[in-house]
Amino acid sequence: KPEAQPFAHLTINAASIPSGSHKVTLSSWYHDRGWAKISNMTLSNGKLRVNQDGFYYLYANICFRHHETSGSVPTDYLQLMVYVVKTSIKIPSSHNLMKGGSTKNWSGNSEFHFYSINVGGFFKLRAGEEISIQVSNPSLLDPDQDATYFGAFKVQDID
Amino acid sequence: KPEAQPFAHLTINAASIPSGSHKVTLSSWYHDRGWAKISNMTLSNGKLRVNQDGFYYLYANICFRHHETSGSVPTDYLQLMVYVVKTSIKIPSSHNLMKGGSTKNWSGNSEFHFYSINVGGFFKLRAGEEISIQVSNPSLLDPDQDATYFGAFKVQDID
Amino acid sequence: KPEAQPFAHLTINAASIPSGSHKVTLSSWYHDRGWAKISNMTLSNGKLRVNQDGFYYLYANICFRHHETSGSVPTDYLQLMVYVVKTSIKIPSSHNLMKGGSTKNWSGNSEFHFYSINVGGFFKLRAGEEISIQVSNPSLLDPDQDATYFGAFKVQDID
């Protein structure tokens, strides 16, 4: 029976979501509770490490939300963004694979605001490379496992 | 070893983004630089041709952006849309497989605006059929390779 | 030749879209017309039943639209949301796998409004489990087959 193909579906660790409106690399994801799972890949300090060369489908879903009971939003005009980043360790370098998001005016009369971003794409990844997620306005992240997650699954070998 | 399955990840050719606010078929994509790649499929005049029957997962990510330094937007109320289109050459016809987008009011006080669309789906494609991308307001497209791209990978054979 | 892997791409049944602005489980999808198709999975009362254990990629694309000619929107501040729900029949329970959406103010001067949501993720599904789609404001759903659909395809076996 062929070796199981690598995959991961990682959900946000609600307890470690940073506050602030700066852009940040999210450092803590669950890999073994609820819908989160990982196989033949490695998770370390928020980065998903590739252990097996291949072509992978990568995806991320990021939800932002704000309720007036938690105070005013950090800014009238928000940039709610996600970046899926590939880091090569051998030659220390980081490159954006995918980005998505929207500028939002959340200063209105509504007491609740919500916005989700989804990105996905097919990429060649080499063993040792790492995938991480950067977001703006991390204090607005929705901590639910169905809301803020990212993942990967290997589709085929290289060559 | 089984023949490598067809795939493509195509990124926008920034040098050939059309101007205007009309709906247009994007005619120039990279297939061999940066994250862009293609195998067992063909790119011709902006259309991704299927060479091998199969069930494919198709996806597109389209980012729009505007900074006030580049002048005013075409209209206060924008329709920022993407259509993933299948064209059959034998019986000349085009059909929308997927669409996504949003109406936006970018006339506000913010000097920068951004919005991304992501669509994806699983489709039966026959050799000779072609996939293309139509967008509204092409002059607002984000030309970065992580922003505006589309792709496909074969998941399984037909029958 | 190995058995064909399970998949489904289901498009909204325009004739049975419910009215109202409440959250509802969509109960009628096409499985055999236009782009809609299904294999080794079962559709029953709007729920997509898994017949074969495995890891599946699930996705949904939901479009909302409103034209002033069809009257005013239910409320100035809309929550346009989708939830992809897994139901286990053995132990009757439902859990959200994915969610996405946005709050929107569609009370503006534009005569047409549009918004799309896309979500996707990789999940372990067991035979007998069912996938369904819940949306808010169903009366605003776009009934086109390229607009409102969901699907799944099996990527690999469990173990």
Epitope: S16, G20, H22, T25, S27, S28, Y77, Q79, S136 | - | -
Partner: antibody
Amino acid sequence: QSVKESGGGLVTPGGTLTLTCTVSGFSLSRNAMSWVRQTPGKGLEWIGYIYSGSSPYYANWAKGRFTISRTSTTVDLKMTSLTTEDTATYFCARHVSDGGWYLDIWGPGTLVAVSL
Amino acid sequence: DMIQTPASVEVVVGGTVTFNCQASQNIGSNLAWYQQKPGQPPKLLIYSASTLASGVPSRFKGSGSGTQFTFTISDVECTDAATYYCQQAYSISNVDNAFGGGTEVVVK
């Protein structure tokens, strides 16, 4: 691209002082700004930051006595109830353009002395 | 919040020096290193734990993630004499100071 602080000087304990950071060559709508101070012979102390049009964020110790605000070309730091321990060089620094909390352009600093 | 060790270190010209920064919580790779010489403002050397800022020589290297970070200068030059600070760039909540206490590098 440059940053310059002004408004420093001698102030008596209990007093109020407002420092101004003036930027040139870049837009405050695209870059956040931080205030950082350095007491004589000591290390750097982050005070707070402000993003475009945003409510500012502060270090725990700075909440209440320090207020950051901005216009299109300046960022102000208002300090109240000053004590001798607030004697320091105050720096204004630009965040990198991609929005990260990394400070890539610093002003030369302005000295604030709190003394009777 | 951020603990730097040692407070001071001596190194000979052409040598290599390494020092550390420890975060009180997992900050992933959200860490910067700055160099400050007397009478000057700090200068950004490294961000995202290991990425060199523009114009910074490759003699400077950052590594680590999570809570443990390391900064290394190889082929030390006289002009490297300065105080070096780490800064967490992860979360502003409950921050007393985003910066470490600094490490003074004395070049012999």
